[in-house]
Interface confidence: medium
């Protein structure tokens, strides 16, 4: 195909076997560097697209994607990644080949995806497509869906990246009641990527694969609803797309909507309006504002105004890095054996967290629920009243968060006794940690009520078995004298338990166990 420019796509790996390239079906490990990525031309209506072999990079690896062009003369170029334009500085080597490079250092999951290089030369215009996969320690990946405007039409495209390829669906609700949260009759599902019907009360796009399900809600201000008690806040990271919808209903068409950022009207081309009549002949208008790739200067108060409704605002905060805000201090709880109780963590985070509850090397599903004030809450109730340490673990692309909980179950002591030649000892579990008394059984005290005040040594919590503390108490023989019956008692708020020991015996010889509640 002689009219196509001769180009070469190369992978330069900055680490031994840190990355590999090949067709998605069978990745080859990189040993040498650089490596030819076998750019293959695909003719498309928009021009020629060269597709490089898929590159697989180990997490934290560093690579350079490079295109070498045999065609001499001036050239200009532009890298595009996740709909953000990145600078491009071509240079020429000693053989007068045009060289365009993109270095990707300390790769993380967020840098996985398609890198498009648009090249304009005197000979031709064309695009080179690199696909970079991060060899994640997780088996599967599922990224939160995001929105894009369809070219030349007022419709939303929902995009989700993941391995395996996620299926995408729109979940729409037209009810103002709680039923939107449930699998209620007001909820409609559309398993397609493009949505033209943008008037619903609640619009979200959900993506699902083997890893689970992730959803993104179209942020909406409804001028017919009373404003929230706290100003709604929307977080985004630099480079992400911003979508914010204003919705209003009026008795007739005689009203207009406008978006302003910090009292300045949004630029033409960064919003579009749609109108429709509802069944009762009222007019519904929506005004969708969007920024395909946000920067720090897109931060601020976005206000939707109407000629017939009170205006409402939302604060959009653009972050360099995601976050998880919550109190990480350890919490300890004490409950009865059959008491209903849930651990809970209240947090604010962006991007949305992945979380789990962990107990004793087993993990339990973590559900998050959004609160009115912009915070979220996760509760864990399925502890089956087992004592021990519970962990809430959350992570997103940029942050990790851990919170530890200790659950103690109130329990009456249960005493085990043991006697040796020199001492008698008793141990007991139970919570709260039991206190000890030793009593002498004699002619004077047949009911064993005479307390032994000396020679007793108490040792607290010497081991912790599955969250159960064990306490022990030892009686020195010389203090008590041989040939005696003694009684050790452990007591706490849940009751008392005693064991009687014959002190003459060298081995374990408890023969009476009393349980006094």
């Amino acid at each position: 195909n002689q009219d196509l420019p001769v180009i070469k796509c190369v992978l330069i790996s900055h680490e031994n076997n840190g990355s590999s390239a090949g067709k998605p079906s069978s990745y080859r490990m990189v040993r040498g560097s650089p490596e030819d990525l076998q750019c293959t031309p695909r003719r498309q209506s928009e021009g020629t697209v060269y597709e490089a072999a898929t590159v697989e990079v180990a997490e934290s690896g560093s690579i350079t994607l490079q295109v070498q062009l045999a065609t001499p003369g001036d050239l200009s170029c532009l890298w595009v990644f996740k709909h953000s334009s990145l600078g491009c500085q071509p240079h020429f080597d000693l053989q007068n080949r045009g060289i365009v490079s993109m270095a990707i250092l300390n790769v993380t999951e967020t840098q996985a995806g398609e890198y498009l290089l648009h090249i304009q030369s005197e000979a031709a215009n064309y695009t080179v497509l690199f696909t970079v996969n991060v060899r994640d320690t997780q088996l599967y990946v599922l990224r939160r869906p995001y929105f894009r405007k369809m070219e030349n039409q007022d419709a939303l495209l929902c995009i989700s990246e993941g391995v395996p390829e996620p299926t995408v669906e729109w979940v729409l609700c037209s009810s103002h009641r709680e039923s939107c949260k449930e699998e209620g009759p007001a909820v409609v599902r559309k398993e397609e990527k493009v949505l033209h019907e943008l008037f619903g009360t609640d619009i979200r796009c959900c993506a699902r694969n083997a890893l689970g399900r992730e959803s993104t809600k179209l942020f909406t201000i409804d001028l017919n609803q009373a404003p929230q008690s706290t100003l709604p806040q929307l977080f985004l990271k630099v480079g992400e797309p911003l979508w914010i919808r204003c919705k209003a209903i009026h008795v007739n068409h005689g009203f207009g909507l406008t978006w302003e950022l910090e009292d300045k009207a949004l630029e033409e081309g960064s919003y579009f309006e749609m109108s429709t009549y509802s069944t009762n002949r009222t007019m519904i208008r929506i005004l969708l504002a969007f920024v395909s790739s946000v920067g720090r200067n897109d931060t601020g108060y976005y206000t939707c105004s109407s000629s017939k409704h009170p205006s409402q605002s939302a604060l959009v905060t653009i972050l360099e890095k995601g976050f998880i805000n919550a109190t990480s201090s350890q919490e300890e709880y004490e409950i009865d054996p059959y008491e209903k109780f849930c651990f809970s963590v209240r947090f604010k985070a962006y991007p949305r967290i992945r979380c789990t509850w962990i107990f004793s090397q087993a993990s339990f599903p973590c559900e998050q629920r959004g609160l009115e004030d912009g915070y979220s809450i996760s509760k864990f109730c399925d502890h089956k009243n087992k004592p021990g340490e519970y962990i809430f673990y959350a992570e997103n692309d940029d942050a990790q968060f851990t919170k530890m909980f200790t659950l103690n179950i109130r329990k009456k002591p249960q005493v085990l006794a043991n006697a040796s030649a020199s001492q008698a000892s008793c141990s007991s579990d139970g919570y709260p940690l039991p206190s000890w008394t030793w009593k002498k059984c004699s002619d004077k005290s047949p009911n064993c009520t005479e307390e032994i005040p000396e020679g007793v040594w108490n040792k607290k919590a010497n081991r912790k078995v599955f969250g159960q503390w064990v306490s022990s108490s030892t009686l020195n023989m010389s203090e008590a004298g041989k040939g005696l019956l003694v009684k050790c008692c452990a007591y706490n708020s849940m009751g008392t338990s005693c064991e009687t020991i014959f002190l003459n015996s060298p081995g374990p010889f408890p023969f009476i166990q009393d349980n006094i509640s």
């Epitope: 090397q361 087993a362 993990s363 962990i391």
Partner: antibody
């Protein structure tokens, strides 16, 4: 790719202790659970316990409670399993295995090559 | 603890045949936290399926897992010569983790 490399075979006397190490190379270490699994000759797999190094939380199977100690050193990316009061029936191949999910526990997707511990007088 | 019982103990089949292995739990397995492993003589186990039905990286699609609650199945649609091995199920949803006793798939 993560690899787990275990210490070499051991021959021990009854009543003594053995400490097997498991060193991770590549990938993240601290936030992934490490399990210890043993397999006696001709027998099935038996889970002994595990640790999530980042949390320092350790869990032991009831059968091994009091005899096994599992630890981890994040600085050297190494997990250890120590079994005391050895008996002849502890003769087995001991495997360390890494969980597939960060920060939680999942199935064990990466395994060490195994360490044969022989207990014999 | 949850006891896992695998059946049959041994499965004698020819290459190309379909293998169905069963794993039954004494109590419901939390959130389908059930895995299947393959082990060949002298080798460490290899993860095939996790979450009852998700295939691990690099596992051929002839291996599939299904089930929830207390009954789980591993199916090998067409046995290849390299599939003859011992298969173990493991639950990791309730402490302590437990394994089934194994099913040996041997050549008939």
């Amino acid at each position: 790719q993560v690899q787990l490399v275990q210490s070499g075979a051991e021959v021990k006397k009854p009543g003594s202790s053995v400490k097997v190490s498991c060193k991770a190379s590549g990938g993240t270490f601290g936030s992934y659970g490490i399990s210890w699994v043993r397999q006696a000759p001709g027998q099935g797999l038996e889970w002994m316990g595990g640790i999530i190094p980042i949390f320092g939380t350790v869990t032991y199977a009831q059968k091994f409670q009091g005899r096994v100690t599992i630890t981890a050193d994040e600085s050297t990316r190494t997990a250890y399993m120590e079994l005391s009061s050895l008996r002849s029936e502890d003769t087995a191949v001991y495997y360390c295995a890494r969980d597939s999910w960060s920060g939680a526990t999942g199935a064990s997707d990466t395994w060490g090559q195994g360490t044969l511990v022989t207990v014999s007088s | 603890e949850i006891v896992l019982t695998q059946s049959p103990g041994t499965l004698s089949l020819s290459p190309g045949e379909r293998a169905t292995l069963s794993c039954r739990a004494s109590h419901s397995v939390s959130s389908s936290y059930l895995a299947w492993y393959q082990q060949k003589p002298g080798q460490a186990p290899r993860l095939l399926i996790y979450g009852a039905s998700s295939r691990a990286t690099g596992i051929p699609d002839r291996f599939s897992g299904s089930g929830s609650g207390t009954d789980f199945t591993l199916t090998i649609s067409r046995l290849e010569p390299e599939d003859f091995a011992v298969y173990y199920c493991q639950q990791y949803g309730s402490p302590p983790r437990t394994f089934g006793q194994g099913t040996k798939v041997e050549i008939k």
